[in-house]
């Protein structure tokens, strides 16, 4: 690679989180090169005996790939030439969490950057009126969370109110024995008010809102990953 040993190039990564059982992206960009054949991308994971992924001379080179990543990794080959070294990780596992290194060699030089990858489960909550209850009750459900989150209710009218005494939250283990279904019930609900069910763990924060009036019910959900500078 000619002068690659003498210069360093800028490599940039973004901390991110993966939702177990789904596909994830480990983001990495670098100063692009004009020749694809001069670019080497290596993804490494701290404390792992083999490589996570290697891309060189325009194709994957997986002879030294670690068993735990076999068949689960891919780079965006058509975007490497423009400086995208991001890694697609299929079927994210809890054990994929850790520190990763994106290591790049081009004809301009070499560089690397680390990223923290968290893994867990997170999902949008849905808030509904529970018509089966004896009093006006709201039910907040989210199908997949891990680690176990906290659930907090809030209301637009009673801002700052503590609803812990009039709510009940349960966590039900899902069939794969890792993630859990979150169900939280809020009692003594008044109409013409907007209630929020906030679910949070160290990976993500999700909010389900419901506005209950005499004539209609409006719902809105929002999910935000924590500690990822996206």
């Amino acid at each position: 690679f000619g002068i690659s040993g003498r210069h360093s190039i800028t490599v940039t990564t973004v901390a991110s989180a993966g939702n177990i059982g789904e596909d994830g992206i480990l983001s990495c960009t670098f100063e692009p090169d004009i020749k694809l054949s001069d670019i080497v991308i290596q993804w490494l994971k701290e404390g792992v005996l083999g490589l996570v992924h290697e891309f060189k001379e325009g194709k994957d080179e997986l002879s030294e790939q670690d068993e735990m990543f076999r068949g689960r990794t891919a780079v965006f080959a058509d975007q490497v030439i423009v400086g995208n070294a991001s890694l697609r990780l299929k079927n994210v596992q809890l054990t994929d969490a850790g520190t990763y290194k994106c290591y790049i060699i081009t004809s301009k030089g070499k560089g690397n950057a680390n990223l923290e990858y968290k893994t867990g489960a997170f999902s949008m909550p849905e808030v509904n009126v529970d018509y089966n209850a004896s009093s006006e009750t709201l039910r907040c459900e989210a199908p997949r969370w891990f680690p176990q989150p906290t659930v907090v209710w809030a209301s637009q009218v009673d801002q700052g109110a503590n609803f812990s005494e009039v709510s009940n939250t349960s966590f039900e283990l899902n069939s794969e024995n890792v993630t859990m279904k979150v169900v939280s019930v809020l009692y003594n609900v008044t109409i013409n008010n907007t209630y929020s069910c906030m679910i949070e763990n160290d990976i993500a924060k999700a909010t389900g809102d419901i506005k209950v009036t005499e004539s209609e019910i409006k719902r809105r959900s929002h999910l935000q990953l924590l500690n990822s500078k996206a």
Partner: antibody
Framework: EVQLLESGGGLVQPGGSLRLSCAAS????????MSWVRQAPGKGLEWVSA????????YYADSVKGRFTISRDNSKNTLYLQMNSLRAEDTAVYYC???????????????WGQGTLVTVSS | DIQMTQSPSSLSASVGDRVTITCRAS??????LAWYQQKPGKAPKLLIY???SLEGGVPSRFSGSGSGTDFTLTISSLQPEDFATYYC?????????FGQGTKVEIK
């Protein structure tokens, strides 16, 4: 100062089981893969098993596959080797050793414990 | 599995001698080779990693070379404390294998 301290060795009958432990200190335990290496009396070194830093990957020599299980508890900075269906040829001093931090760019087996003797005999 | 063959299995030498030990892998291991020194009743000590990188604190009389399948450990001027058994070890990806050892004895 990096220290590795093995324990759990002893005399066991063929077909029996034993669990070895290796207590680590002086470094960020979860950042490193760890290995077990054994040495039969008067013989050479034989790599037995390794485990990744997070515990998600385990690796075994063919001679112990299906009988030995490596594990770790990063909250206790401890490495384990569960040995089942022990045979006379498993008699050896068992060492734990610090393995790599990063593939291809760091040292490995740079720190070793003092070893613990496992004797399989009737 | 990758096999490692060391030669000779033992050698006799004198203080000040230049000693060379060779190690051959059954398939290419690039530069993923380490050398260890072991004295009786002691744990092994890392000397060389990545075929030619000297571990911190190891005297410069020890050197390693080679890549692919053929590797060499050289002690440029043997010292009294160097009489020991030396092992090569491959660490290609997720397997590790040791050579059978070379015992360096006093002539």
């Amino acid at each position: 100062e990096v220290q590795l301290l093995e324990s759990g060795g002893g005399l066991v009958q063929p077909g029996g089981s034993l669990r070895l432990s290796c207590a680590a200190s002086g470094f960020t335990f979860s950042s490193y893969a760890m290995s077990w290496v054994r040495q039969a009396p008067g013989k050479g070194l034989e790599w037995v098993s390794a485990i990744s830093g997070g515990g998600g990957s385990t690796y075994y020599a063919d001679s112990v596959k299906g009988r030995f299980t490596i594990s770790r508890d990063n909250s206790k900075n401890t490495l384990y080797l569960q040995m089942n269906s022990l045979r006379a040829e498993d008699t050896a001093v068992y060492y734990c050793a610090r393995d790599i931090q990063w593939f291809g760019e760091s040292t490995l087996f740079d720190y070793w414990g003092q070893g613990t003797l496992v004797t399989v005999s009737s | 599995d990758i096999q490692m063959t060391q030669s000779p299995s033992s050698l006799s030498a004198s203080v000040g001698d230049r000693v060379t030990i060779t190690c051959r892998a059954s398939q290419s291991i690039r530069s993923w080779l380490a050398w260890y020194q072991q004295k009786p009743g002691k744990a092994p000590k890392l000397l060389i990693y990545k075929a030619s990188s000297l571990e911190g604190g190891v005297p410069s009389r020890f050197s390693g070379s080679g890549s692919g399948t053929d590797f060499t450990l050289t002690i440029s001027s043997l010292q009294p404390e160097d009489f020991a058994t030396y092992y090569c070890q491959q660490y290609n990806s997720y397997s590790r294998t040791f050579g059978q050892g070379t015992k360096v004895e006093i002539k």
